[in-house]
């Protein structure tokens, strides 16, 4: 499955929306800096077969999407800038699903890496648990809004990698 | 390979303008701080100011406000410190470092390799 | 501001001993503590960052310790190559600070 060009441009455009959300001084925050553990072996594309990759992907995205359509975001964040982030990874979710589809006949390997799927929705639960503790301050948010631009940036390094592969 | 690339000493008069410059390179340059620490001759490390390139939002410490201002050009990677009128007391080694801002990454893991100013009459 | 205060100033050791540097914060910094080396006329060098977390590609016989406002660092035992100058810094709060140093010379 090739990924279209337009999911790459998505998931710059998502990227650029996040970066724009932010509503206070990213300065005033530094005290609520948090280690989430990043499960950066995750987006090394090179250890798995395409399909694992585009199924953490995937993930990545799916989880993304749900942090930021809780109530709890829509109070925190400014609505536009919200409603139009989320649709960039609806957009990307489709694409990713299409892929999914696409690479289950031809890769006979396990769809998933479970371990994998497993270590990204434990790192989405570390953020919530954070979330919940810090009661959704905005400061908490502001250093979740800098961890998420950080995962995405992961998240489009490896889909580069996947397209070098193609 | 990550590098902060500072531009080259310089000697200046009392009461002259200075801009010094810091290139970033093998990151993503908005993705981190920027930030600047003088070294007297013989001395200490002193921070001076932070600045964010996405935004050009930037904090400085309260013994350099208004004596210097942080700057940054986020299209070519660059990042700058200057002088509207220096003072001999400016003569120092400047370097600048980088900064993983709201990340959990280490703090000021690159580092330029220090811009020599000299003020003298 | 956060005053940081570094002890001893300078110290005199042999290559092999065991060296400990101890920096206090005028209030709790948590562990938003960094560890730096200087050698002269050289850019400062990242040792460790929050208080214990060792920066990739030090050797492991640099490590720190505490929290709060009490920090320390040790070389468990000293290179030749380790005597420089060593700064702390506190991170949790701008305007960021340094200690003012500790210079560790051959005895």
């Known amino acids: 499955c090739d990924l279209p060009q337009t999911h790459s441009l998505g998931n710059r455009r998502a990227l650029i929306l996040l970066g724009q959300m932010g509503r206070i001084s990213p300065f005033s925050c530094l005290k609520d800096r948090h280690d989430f553990r990043i499960p950066q072996e995750e987006f090394d594309g090179n250890q798995f077969q395409k399909a694992q990759a585009i199924s953490v992907l995937h993930e990545m995205i799916q989880q993304t999407f749900n942090l930021f359509s809780t109530e709890d975001s829509s109070a925190a964040w400014e609505q536009s800038l919200l409603e139009k982030f989320s649709t960039e990874l609806y957009q990307q979710l489709n694409d990713l699903e299409a892929c999914v589809i696409q690479e289950v006949g031809v890769e006979e390997t396990p769809l998933m890496n479970e371990d994998s799927i497993l270590a990204v929705r434990k790192y989405f639960q570390r953020i919530t648990l954070y979330l919940i503790e810090r009661k959704y301050s905005p400061c908490a948010w502001e250093v979740v809004r800098a961890e998420i631009m950080r995962s995405l940036s992961f998240s489009t390094n490896l889909q580069k990698r996947l397209r070098r592969k193609d | 390979e990550v590098q902060l690339v500072q531009s080259g000493a310089e000697v200046k008069k009392p009461g002259e303008s200075l801009k010094i410059s810091c290139k970033g390179s093998?990151?993503?340059?908005?993705?981190?701080?920027i930030g600047w620490v003088r070294q007297m001759p013989g001395k200490g490390l002193e921070w001076m100011g932070i600045i964010d390139p996405s935004d050009s939002d930037t904090r400085y410490s309260p013994s350099f406000q208004g004596q210097v201002t942080i700057s940054a050009d986020k299209s070519i990677s660059t990042a700058y410190l200057q002088w509207s009128s220096l003072k001999a007391s400016d003569t120092a080694m400047y370097y600048c470092?980088?900064?993983?801002?709201?990340?959990?990454?280490?703090?000021?893991?690159?580092w330029g390799q220090g811009t020599l100013v000299t003020v003298s009459s | 501001d956060i005053q940081m205060t570094q002890s001893p100033s300078s110290l005199s050791a042999s290559v092999g001993d065991r060296v400990t540097i101890t920096c206090r914060a005028s209030q709790s910094i948590n562990r938003f503590l960094n560890w730096y080396q200087q050698k002269p006329g050289k850019a400062p060098k990242l040792l460790i960052y929050a208080a214990s977390s060792l920066q990739s590609g030090v050797p492991s016989r640099f490590s720190g310790s505490g929290s709060g406002t009490d920090f320390t660092l040790t070389i468990s035992s000293l290179q030749p190559e380790d005597f420089a100058t060593y700064y702390c810094q506190q991170a949790i709060d701008l305007p960021f600070t340094f200690g003012q140093g500790t210079k560790v010379e051959i005895k």
């Open positions: 093998g990151y993503s340059f908005t993705s981190y701080w």
């Open positions: 470092a980088r900064h993983p801002g709201l990340n959990w990454a280490p703090d000021f893991d690159y």
